[in-house]
Interface confidence: medium
Amino acid sequence: SQVSQNCHNGSYEISVLMMGNSAFAEPLKNLEDAVNEGLEIVRGRLQNAGLNVTVNATFMYSDGLIHNSGDCRSSTCEGLDLLRKISNAQRMGCVLIGPSCTYSTFQMYLDTELSYPMISAGSFGLSCDYKETLTRLMSPARKLMYFLVNFWKTNDLPFKTYSWSTSYVYKNGTETEDCFWYLNALEASVSYFSHELGFKVVLRQDKEFQDILMDHNRKSNVIIMCGGPEFLYKLKGDRAVAEDIVIILVDLFNDQYFEDNVTAPDYMKNVLVLTLSPGNSLLNSSFSRNLSPTKRDFALAYLNGILLFGHMLKIFLENGENITTPKFAHAFRNLTFEGYDGPVTLDDWGDVDSTMVLLYTSVDTKKYKVLLTYDTHVNKTYPVDMSPTFTWKNSKLPNDITGRGPQ
């Protein structure tokens, strides 16, 4: 049956799913604060545009009995079945914010009529790609994959003169939700990354990873992993590493590398860190004051989801168009809106575009320095440091295959 929407006559409601299983272990109170801060901004923007309407959020809570681990991989269809019943029995808002787990979003999308937009802070997996009414406000796995292929192929930079075509991927199954789906995408046999690489092997045991570091018979010098520096240290410790090994550490939602007083530990010298360009105004925000750098991105995505809805609502109201139509549901893509921290661009499929930053550890200053940036919107790499003070020979990245190039 068609869901009745509380979305007309000057009153516009946002349904926010506060599910016990979440992409990041974030207290729901912080997400509430982010949503409420977003609502204040939206109301102000609509008022400034001369639109005298009411915008509210309804929070739908789960007490998380079955999801008490907070682990997305425990999310079941049963909870989604229940949510659909609740949604149908009462009035749905104009837009649904949540869930953030790939399994939940995928299942929910399958079982929901495409009559209203879904905005997700998460849903990183490839299975949530190309969904007509789903918008994702945190970088999905597809964007990571495109960067990696672009970087692997690059061979015309002063510090990277070899195309790469091989890689190891370390994936032990204990990853956070974002890392889990990023690495799943790299592991998938049918994916852009796998298609473009000649050799790729997944390392699942700590010992496998540790052995590769000094194995003269290794098939690639490049190892991709996902997590923070502490995660790497737990795995690698102070073990010796062959000088032509390059570890790519994917740590997108972590601003700590850009803080003034941060010094890169010695074990990071063979590592390139892939992260997102940091925001500029978040540190003093009322909703983010108590958040860790990672969780700040998650809460920010909720806030930006509210601002995105406000942006679309304003456009449709100014054009005199109906909100409860398929046109509105399909409109949350191929646009740029004013986010909390500056402009936010969504691609043709409603996925957020961003600037990814590749960092290296300067052997001179022991600081993280920007090597290059990558614009996911145009799939283009921009070198920043043309003469990096690398640990690698001749200040150039080695070939990916042992025995060729700088050793």
Epitope: S62, L65, I66, H67, E78, G79, D81, L82, N88
Partner: nanobody, 119 residues
Framework: QVQLQESGGGLVQAGGSLRLSCAAS????????MGWFRQAPGKEREFVAA????????YYGDSVKGRFTISRDNAKNTMYLQMNRLKPEDTAVYYC????????????WGQGTQVTVSS
């Protein structure tokens, strides 16, 4: 469809407690998601709480979160709503609802039980 019968409503002072029950007929009770809704005079029906067939997933409306607790006993074919710290604005007719797993709707509804909270 299952037949549903609510009980346990009544008059209570603000700050007090009540426990509502919803008895269901049929042998496949555990394959039904169950919910509580309420409707105050002149207002729209409001979602209160819901519980999945196994009891593993539970959701609450924001106005009752932290005060009301939903539970079920599949052996007794009964669902419960424990209501604590009641407020005058909780005054309404409370309906229990059921819907089989996999369906998008609560398609069975009880007749309702009146809860009145006086100040």
């Amino acid at each position: 469809q299952v037949q549903l019968q609510e009980s346990g409503g009544g008059l209570v002072q603000a700050g007090g407690s009540l426990r509502l029950s919803c008895a269901a007929s049929g042998r496949t009770f555990s394959s039904y998601a169950m919910g509580w809704f309420r409707q105050a005079p002149g207002k729209e029906r409001e979602f209160v709480a819901a519980i999945s067939g196994s009891g593993g997933s539970i959701y609450y409306g924001d106005s009752v979160k932290g005060r009301f607790t939903i539970s079920r006993d599949n052996a007794k074919n009964t669902m419960y709503l424990q209501m604590n710290r009641l407020k005058p604005e909780d005054t309404a007719v409370y309906y229990c609802a059921a819907g089989p797993l996999g369906s998008p709707d609560f398609d069975s509804w009880g007749q309702g039980t009146q809860v009145t909270v006086s100040s």
